[in-house]
């Protein structure tokens, strides 16, 4: 009696158990009785990733450098392609469809990992002994400068934006 | 339901071209399947001559020695068969057939 | 070519017997993906051959279940599990796996 369930690649139609096409290759007509699938490969700028019975293959994925995207890896008949963004900038999703400009951490802020072609900066607010007085995408939080190993004197306290003012010793007695 | 039927002539003078067509009805020569023509000698058993893909593209039997020519006629869901320099061999009852569904076949005798 | 030879050429049994025909191909029938196409026919007396089984052991539709295929590889067989007076004709089997498609030289089946 005809099949009511097919095996792992293959799928049901007109009561016949079809083998799916292969990963790359799109499905030009389907099984019969007497004939099997028959499958025809995706040309340059398609592709198909998985074991399918779709009559078209998709489109290879544009990298628009307008923008601001560039190839990361160039499609096959099996893999789409894959963008990344140009230097400075990152994506705004994890399917990178367009790009955005990488974000500085401010004043009091340090770079915790510097940005990449699919990440933001991140940022860390600069802990107890450092700081960061500029607007950067790439500077960590720096240590406060150690007026003792100068044989010098705090003269005013750092900040998360400020280092210290070290100042001479008091030579009093 | 599909049906399909043969027509053409039933005597044919030997070293003419023998022409049937297969006519189709209740479902597209475009759609899928391979249609085919198939003989039986007088008291003999089936021979396949060759098909015509729902993609117009062909197969034929080597035996027939480039003798055999299978068109369609997309228009009126037909499909024909020419058979070259006929002989007295080529007496037969030939059948068209999508395989599953078969005509009921025509008779051609090659005699002068 | 794959040669299709038949076994017995004839057979004759009593109605309610079961009957087995066999059929072996020169080469294997089994393609790259794992598939055989071998079908098996009836011809009545006077009529056009009719699907039986497809793809070994698949029963066509309005087959009645007393027909049954089997095999792989190079060897099939057609059973039928008990004969009735409408089963009489020729038996015939069908390798679509190659091409040049080719039939077995045919089963005679008669009631005794």
């Known amino acids: 009696e005809p099949p009511t369930a097919c095996r792992e690649k293959q799928y049901l139609i007109n009561s016949q158990c079809c083998s799916l096409c292969q990963p790359g290759q799109k499905l030009v007509s389907d099984c019969t009785e007497f004939t099997e699938t028959e499958c025809l490969p995706c040309s340059e700028s398609e592709f198909l990733d998985t074991w399918n019975r779709e009559t078209r293959c998709h489109q290879h994925k544009y990298c628009d450098p307008n923008l601001g995207l560039q190839v990361q890896q160039k499609g096959t008949s099996e893999t789409d392609t894959i963008c990344t963004c140009e230097e400075g900038l990152h994506c705004t999703s994890e399917s990178c469809e367009s790009c955005v400009p990488h974000r500085s951490c401010l004043p009091g802020f340090g770079v915790k990992q510097i940005a990449t072609g699919v990440s933001d900066t991140i940022c860390e607010p600069c802990p107890v002994g450092f700081f960061s007085n500029v607007s950067s995408a790439f500077e960590k939080c720096r240590p406060w400068t150690s007026c003792e190993t100068k044989d010098l004197v705090v003269q005013q306290a750092g900040t998360n934006k400020t280092d210290v003012v070290c100042g001479p010793q008091d030579r009093q007695r | 339901e599909v049906q399909l039927q043969e027509s053409g002539p039933g005597l044919v003078k030997p070293s003419e071209t023998l022409s049937l067509t297969c006519t189709v009805s209740?479902?597209?020569?475009?759609?899928?399947?391979?249609w085919n023509w198939i003989r039986q000698p007088p008291g003999k058993g089936l021979e396949w001559m060759g098909y015509?893909?729902?993609?117009?593209?062909?197969n034929y039997n080597p035996s027939l020695k480039n003798r055999v020519t299978i068109s369609r006629d997309t228009s009126k869901n037909q499909f024909s068969l020419k058979l070259s320099s006929v002989t007295a061999a080529d007496t037969a009852v030939y059948y068209c057939?999508?395989?599953?569904?078969w005509g009921q076949g025509t008779t051609v005798t090659v005699s002068s | 070519d794959a040669v299709m030879t038949q076994t017995p050429l004839s057979l004759s049994v009593t109605p309610g017997q079961p009957a087995s025909i066999s059929c072996r191909s020169s080469q294997s029938l089994e393609n790259t993906n794992g598939n055989t196409f071998l079908n098996w026919y009836l011809q009545k007396p006077g009529q056009s051959p009719q699907l039986l089984i497809y793809r070994v052991s698949n029963r066509f539709s309005g087959v009645p279940d007393r027909f049954s295929g089997s095999g792989s590889g190079t060897d099939f067989t057609l059973k039928i599990s008990r004969v009735e007076a409408e089963d009489v004709g020729v038996y015939y089997c069908l390798q679509v796996t190659h091409v040049p498609f080719t039939f077995g030289q045919g089963t005679k089946l008669e009631i005794k």
């Open positions: 057939a999508r395989l599953d569904y």
């Open positions: 209740g479902y597209s020569i475009t759609s899928n399947y391979y």
């Open positions: 015509i893909r729902y993609d117009g593209s062909n």
